[in-house]
Interface confidence: medium
């Protein structure tokens, strides 16, 4: 399987909400011993490998934001900790998973990474991630709503296996 990022750039005005999205592609083993660990974190564009550094999103680590379930099951983080920080991660039956950030400020600007780990028999088997940029803007040049820019065909299968 691999991870696609439908949009590589999100440009949003201050105060707006945004939902960053990744999509799980390819054959997904639905065996009872297979689960998927999905999460989000911030990173910086490292010279060697994008998304290699895992930094918190609004002080929440990738462990705080993770979803852990089988195949294309739906799930979401509804715990108070994430919601108090204006965050919610979710996953649907179609392989889409997302993080919603509310009330954006300039400090939310940066590189965001989604991570999917396939776990078999409690052992990590396969790990892929996708990356996207969030730019929060203010002033007369800021858009009135979030504007999203599709990934190029090469980027949309923004795959890095670990």
């Amino acid at each position: 399987f691999k991870v696609a990022t439908p949009y590589s750039l999100y440009v949003c005005p201050e105060g707006q909400n945004v939902t960053l999205t990744c999509r799980l592609l390819g054959p997904v083993d639905k065996g009872h011993d297979v689960t998927f660990y999905k999460t989000w974190y911030r990173s910086s564009r490292g010279e060697v490998q994008t998304c290699s550094e895992r930094r918190p999103i609004r002080n929440l680590t990738f462990q705080d934001l993770h979803l852990h379930h089988g195949g294309h099951q739906a799930a979401n983080t509804s715990h108070d900790l994430a919601q108090r920080h204006g965050l919610e991660s979710a996953s649907d039956h179609h392989g889409n998973f997302s993080i919603t950030m509310r009330n954006l400020t300039l400090l939310d600007s940066g590189l965001y990474c989604c991570l999917v780990v396939e776990i078999r028999h409690h052992h990590s088997e396969h790990r892929v991630h996708g990356a996207m940029e969030l730019q929060v803007q203010t002033g007369k040049d800021a858009p009135s709503n979030c504007v999203v820019y599709p990934s190029s065909s090469q980027d949309s299968e923004n795959i890095t296996a670990a």
Epitope: S44, R58, H85, N103, T105, L106, Q137, T138
Partner: antibody
Framework: QSVEESGGRLVAPGTPLTLTCAVS????????MSWVRQAPGKGLEYIGV??????GPYYTSWAKGRFTISKTSTTVDLKITSPTTEDTATYFC?????????WGPGTPVTVSS | QVLTQTPSPVSAAVGGTVTINCHSS????????LSWFQQKPGQPPKLLIY???NLASGVPSRFKGSGSGTPFTLTIYDLECGDAATYYC????????????FGGGTEVVVQ
């Protein structure tokens, strides 16, 4: 809308000091807040910022370990962990990160034995 | 990050034009996270320009900011006596952690 700093005073080197920034007319859940200082006759120095929710705090490299920024629902605190004479300055609290659009009058801190 | 302002000091006559430059050792975030401030003795700084070229609320249009990435320029047209002050640029960076830095300041003398 206003911000006002307090807590500045004369302290001995090594004695921790906490400055408080009280805000009114706007919510800290909607604005990032920064701390900036200015030594007598010198330029502005950026210390760090704390964001909405619990984004940050983030510190400039020289300030890491020397300062701690925290907040409540209506105040933002700056703790000078172990002041030295070089920390003598006026400390400003400002609304925003780069777009610092609302400043307090500043609170003076003198570090001397 | 290092923000270098030139020149300092700078002087011009009433009605004249002053240009201040701000050069960053590294591009600011989004190429436009740069602000300009005016500070007079005994007062806190006042925001003039944000995101490189946006005029802050209540600031006369005589003040103009320009530039992208680095360098940046603040131009003051039709200089008035009240414009005598020290001007600072401040850049925002999002490499590793988010942080900012100020330039060293430029004193503007109005003759």
């Amino acid at each position: 809308q206003s911000v006002e700093e307090s807590g500045g005073r004369l302290v001995a080197p090594g004695t921790p000091l906490t400055l408080t920034c009280a805000v009114s007319g706007f919510s800290l859940s909607s604005y990032d807040m920064s701390w900036v200082r200015q030594a007598p006759g010198k330029g502005l120095e950026y210390i760090g910022v704390i964001g909405t929710g619990s984004t940050g705090p983030y510190y400039t490299s020289w300030a890491k370990g020397r300062f701690t920024i925290s907040k409540t629902s209506t105040t933002v605190d700056l703790k000078i962990t172990s002041p030295t004479t070089e920390d003598t300055a006026t400390y400003f609290c400002a609304r925003g990160w780069v777009k610092l659009d609302l400043w307090g009058p500043g609170t003076p801190v003198t570090v001397s034995s | 990050q290092v923000l270098t302002q030139t020149p300092s000091p700078v002087s011009a006559a009433v009605g004249g034009t002053v240009t201040i430059n701000c050069h960053s050792s590294q591009s600011v975030y989004n190429d436009n996270y740069l602000s300009w401030f005016q500070q007079k003795p005994g007062q806190p700084p006042k925001l003039l320009i944000y995101q490189a070229s946006n005029l802050a609320s209540g600031v006369p249009s005589r003040f103009k900011g320009s530039g992208s990435g680095t360098p940046f320029t603040l131009t003051i047209y039709d200089l008035e006596c009240g414009d005598a002050a020290t001007y600072y640029c401040a850049g925002g960076y999002n490499i590793g952690d988010s942080y900012s830095a100020f330039g060293g300041g430029t004193e503007v003398v109005v003759q």
